[in-house]
């Protein structure tokens, strides 16, 4: 969480941002809130990015003003116009690109004063893994697949019964480049699995951590997946 204040003493307002991550090729949100003003026409929101000459986005007098917008953001940004009046300056970002990563500044002007806060935005790819029993294999085998990751993640297997066991000798992980030549499909195979046990396939890079669980018994198979972003720090 980053909390910024205006520089000019009593003419300062609090602006709060939250570091976040964008999934490339999908739509993202850069979070920013501020002390609200009662009059929409008095509120100016400017989003800037370090190293970028033009603005990322500008909202003033109750509408977008995009004449100074940098070309790389054209047609890709919006604020939640109906929520600006209650202090929400968060930015929607369409079709997140790797190059969108960096330091952003949310700069606010209201009748009460000015304020700003920075936000670190990471970009990459992350997806939910699915673990299945591989019936084509010669021995009892589990197959963990996740369609889109970047940068290349690590994959670790764990089991409920053999807690702390190292499965690297009985697993094999491969990374296959997807058609857009950036993200990769993750496939990890675990051999010699035993019945009546819960196995977890954990995929992690510096942006996200995802886990796929599978419980195999003689009568049924239960699956569960979970994904967590790692860098959501507020400012």
């Amino acid at each position: 969480l980053i909390i910024g204040f205006g520089i000019s003493g009593r003419h300062s307002i609090t602006v709060t941002t939250v570091a976040s991550a964008g999934n490339i090729g999908e739509d993202g949100i850069l979070s920013c809130t501020f002390e609200p003003d009662i009059k929409l026409s008095d509120i100016v929101i400017q989003w800037l990015k370090e190293g970028v000459l033009g603005l990322v986005h500008e909202f003033k007098e109750g509408k977008d003003e995009l004449s100074e917008q940098d070309e790389m953001f054209r047609g890709r940004t919006a604020v939640f116009a109906d929520q600006v009046i209650v202090g929400n300056a968060s930015l929607r970002l369409k079709n997140v690109q790797l190059t969108d990563a960096g330091t952003y500044k949310c700069y606010i002007i209201t009748s009460k004063g000015k304020g700003n806060a920075n936000l670190e935005y990471k970009t990459g790819a992350f997806s939910m893994p699915e673990v299945n029993v591989d019936y084509n294999a010669s021995s009892e085998t589990l197959r963990c697949e996740a369609p889109r990751w970047f940068p290349q993640p690590t994959v670790v297997w764990a089991s409920q019964v053999d807690q702390g066991a190292n499965f690297s000798e009985v697993s094999n992980t491969s990374f296959e480049l997807n058609s857009e030549n950036v993200t990769m499909k993750v496939v990890s195979v675990l051999y010699n699995v035993t019945i009546n046990n819960t196995y977890s396939c954990m995929i992690e890079n510096d942006i996200a951590k995802a886990t796929g669980d599978i419980k195999v018994t003689e009568s049924e198979i239960k699956r569960r997946s979970h994904l967590q972003l790692l860098n959501s720090k507020a400012s």
Partner: antibody, heavy 119, light 107 residues
């Protein structure tokens, strides 16, 4: 109520330049993006390009560098120029307003003008 | 560029029934998709944007769904004025591209 009206010649000779103007009434040309879209007879829609009131533009690469879109805010107009036309450029040409900066659907359209490329 | 494919090319449905039109993108466009209706001799009319949000003045019988690569426009209880050509359009990436259209005709 915003209204758009295309104007320009209905017949252009091959290798010459197609020029069309879109006049916007019932609202300001400022603070919206504006586009040209075309539709060959009996076929689908093709996006040509856009312009913002500040002059920022972007064109469809399929038309290479044959397209120029310009704006005249004092007249509430924007224009299309397409050079070196061929019979394949025969189409109904529409001007349209982009719904907003994020949702690039087209909410207001002109009625369209048929431009035939023929000698 | 992102290629938009609509199916079927022609759909025959009786008035009062439901019509389901499909649109597929060659890669994910998230929810950045619009639907239009076009009648002969007229400009297209925006029905849906954001894959599922109805544009101003569009009747509730029109609904859009889907995200990623698969999208559907559903028209329930078809009225005589609904028979037209329908186009989908992605605005996830440049250039903006349209589907080839689905002609909805009276059965």
């Amino acid at each position: 109520q915003v209204q758009l009206q295309e104007s320009g010649p209905g017949l252009v000779k091959p290798s010459e330049t197609l020029s069309l103007t879109c006049t916007v009434s019932g609202g300001s040309i400022s603070s919206y993006y504006w586009s040209w879209i075309r539709q060959p007879p009996g076929k689908g829609l093709e996006w040509i390009g856009y312009i913002y009131y500040s002059g920022s533009t972007n064109n469809n690469p399929s038309l290479k560098s044959r397209v120029t879109i310009s704006v005249d805010t004092s007249k509430n107009q924007f224009s299309l120029k397409l050079i070196s036309v061929t019979a394949a450029d025969t189409a109904v040409y529409y001007c349209a307003r982009v719904y907003n900066n994020y949702d690039w659907g087209f909410d207001y359209w002109g009625q369209g003008t048929l431009v035939t490329v023929s000698s | 560029e992102i290629v938009m494919t609509q199916s079927p090319a022609t759909l025959s449905v009786s008035p009062g029934e439901r019509a389901t039109l499909s649109c597929r993108a060659s890669q994910s466009v998230s929810s950045n998709l619009a639907w239009y209706q076009q009648k002969p001799g007229q400009a297209p009319r925006l029905l849906i944007y954001g894959a599922s949000t109805r544009a101003t003045g569009i009747p509730a019988r029109f609904s859009g769904s889907g995200s990623g690569t698969e999208f559907t426009l559903t028209i329930r209880s078809l009225q005589s004025e609904d028979f037209a050509v329908y186009y989908c359009q992605q605005y996830h990436n440049w250039p903006l591209t349209f589907g080839g259209g689905t002609k909805l005709e009276i059965k």
